[in-house]
């Protein structure tokens, strides 16, 4: 899987997860959250040759003839496969708010 | 949606659905499908800004973050996600197969 | 264990290209990020530019004319360029890491590189 | 740029003693900063980031904390070691910069 384990310990061009810190005032302009100050985004970054962790059929077969015509800018990408929510603390007034946001942190990625 | 009813009938820089002719036997070598010769394939290009079509939480907060630090490449990507199966003629031997190969056909796209 | 070691030439004649390497090991250059920081003698630190994971480059905007920043992930090496030094540019140069991608500070530093630009 | 300024320039302290660095960031840098330690002839060492987070293997006499735009180092019992030159740096926006540097000397 081209997740932590893998990818932060290899030098690894082609598609993999990359370390990125997100810091919510600073980096979104968000000031609305209160805790955390920031958290580990992560994404997807690298090539997508033939076979390197090809996500479907057509992704493939993409990346098969992208070997061809490469001129066609017709490969695929690297994206996020598995997400997991972050916890946020927020508030409404003077009232401390608890809620998950769904799909904010890139655990693994995939070529698609 | 992506797809192309939108795309086909705009000029749109931005992520978007790209038609693509693929041969078998030209572009990926595959000389043993009988039938088609070839399909229309597709596939998914394009920038993504801000709130284009973001396909989760974690693909809006990059592309966000991503207006302000371009040269991280930590940009979400245009690809694929509705897919469909394309029908194939093939022979073992002398024996016609028919088989329904899935995900080989993009019908939209989105920024992931 | 990580550890980031800078190398070249200590003495670079005025207006020619100042040359410098960064060899790193225990960690990826497609993981983190390393940046270039220097310090004249006696004087405080100034950051001058950085190189990511994905090979992206940001520079200190005081001195994006002159400097160049790319790096070999293969060997696990980071190079500076800096053109058209002067006098201004004697000090010891180092190369550090950031502990995550756009986290900005740096816990892990080379040990230095003194270049001293004279005729 | 964003300029950051140190005080005192040097600050005299005996062994055993508190010692309070102060840095002020001249706009709002919303708790990027940290704070480096170098000793002659060697490079920095990051002691605190995000403020207040102490890095790890570093002693817990080192504190950060901060007020409005005035961001403090404190040592709260200086051991002979601990005699050296001490760096505030923004991580909030490039470029980054830092401030010139307190020298902590023995009294």
């Known amino acids: 899987a081209l997740d932590a384990a893998y990818c932060f310990r290899n030098v690894q061009d082609n598609c993999c997860l990359r370390p990125l810190y997100i810091d919510f005032k600073r980096d979104l302009g968000w000031k609305w959250i209160h805790e955390p100050k920031g958290y580990n985004a992560n994404f997807c970054a690298g090539a997508c040759p033939y076979l390197w962790s090809s996500d479907t059929q057509h992704s493939r077969v993409l990346s098969l003839y992208n070997t061809i015509n490469p001129e066609a800018s017709a490969s695929p990408c690297c994206v996020s496969q598995d997400l997991e929510p972050l916890t946020i603390l927020y508030y409404i007034g003077k009232t401390p708010k608890i809620e998950q946001l769904s799909n904010m942190i890139v655990k693994s990625c995939k070529c698609s | 949606a992506l797809d192309a009813a939108y795309c086909f009938r705009n000029v749109q820089d931005n992520c978007c659905l790209r038609p693509l002719y693929i041969d078998f036997k030209r572009d990926l070598g595959w000389k043993w499908i009988h039938e088609p010769k070839g399909y229309n394939a597709n596939f998914c290009a394009g920038a993504c800004p801000y709130l284009w079509s973001s396909d989760t939480q974690h693909s809006r907060v990059l592309s966000l973050y991503n207006t302000i630090n371009p040269e991280a490449s930590a940009s979400p990507c245009c690809v694929s996600q509705d897919l469909e199966p394309l029908t194939i003629l093939y022979y073992i031997g002398k024996t016609p197969k028919i088989e329904q190969l899935s995900n080989m056909i993009v019908k939209s796209c989105k920024c992931s | 264990e990580v550890q980031l070691q800078e190398s070249g030439p200590g003495l670079v004649k005025p207006s020619e290209t100042l040359s410098l390497t960064c060899t790193v090991s225990?960690?990826?250059?497609?993981?983190?990020?390393v940046h270039w920081v220097r310090q004249p003698p006696g004087k405080g630190l100034e950051w001058m530019g950085l190189i990511w994971n994905t090979g992206g480059t940001r520079y200190n905007s005081a001195l994006k004319s002159r400097l160049t920043i790319s790096k070999d992930t293969s060997k696990s090496q980071v190079s500076l360029k800096l053109s058209s030094v002067t006098a201004a540019d004697t000090a010891v140069y180092y190369c550090?890491?950031?502990?995550?991608?756009?986290?900005?500070?740096?816990?892990?530093w080379g040990p230095g590189t003194l270049v001293t630009v004279s005729s | 740029e964003i300029v950051m300024t140190q005080s005192p320039a040097t600050l005299s302290v005996s062994p055993g003693e508190r010692a309070t660095l102060s840095c002020l960031a001249s706009e709002d840098i919303y708790s990027n900063l940290a704070w480096y330690q170098q000793k002659p002839g060697q490079s920095p060492r990051l002691l605190i980031y995000d403020a207040r987070s102490l890095q790890d293997g570093v002693p817990a006499r080192f504190s950060g904390s901060e007020s409005g735009p005035e961001y403090t180092l404190t040592i709260s019992s200086l051991q002979s070691e601990d005699f050296a030159v001490y760096f505030c740096?923004?991580?909030?926006?490039?470029?980054?910069?830092f401030g010139q540097g307190t020298k902590v000397e023995i009294k």
């Open positions: 225990g960690f990826s250059l497609t993981t983190y990020n």
């Open positions: 550090a890491r950031d502990p995550v991608p756009n986290k900005w500070h740096f816990d892990f």
């Open positions: 740096q923004q991580h909030h926006a490039y470029p980054f910069t």
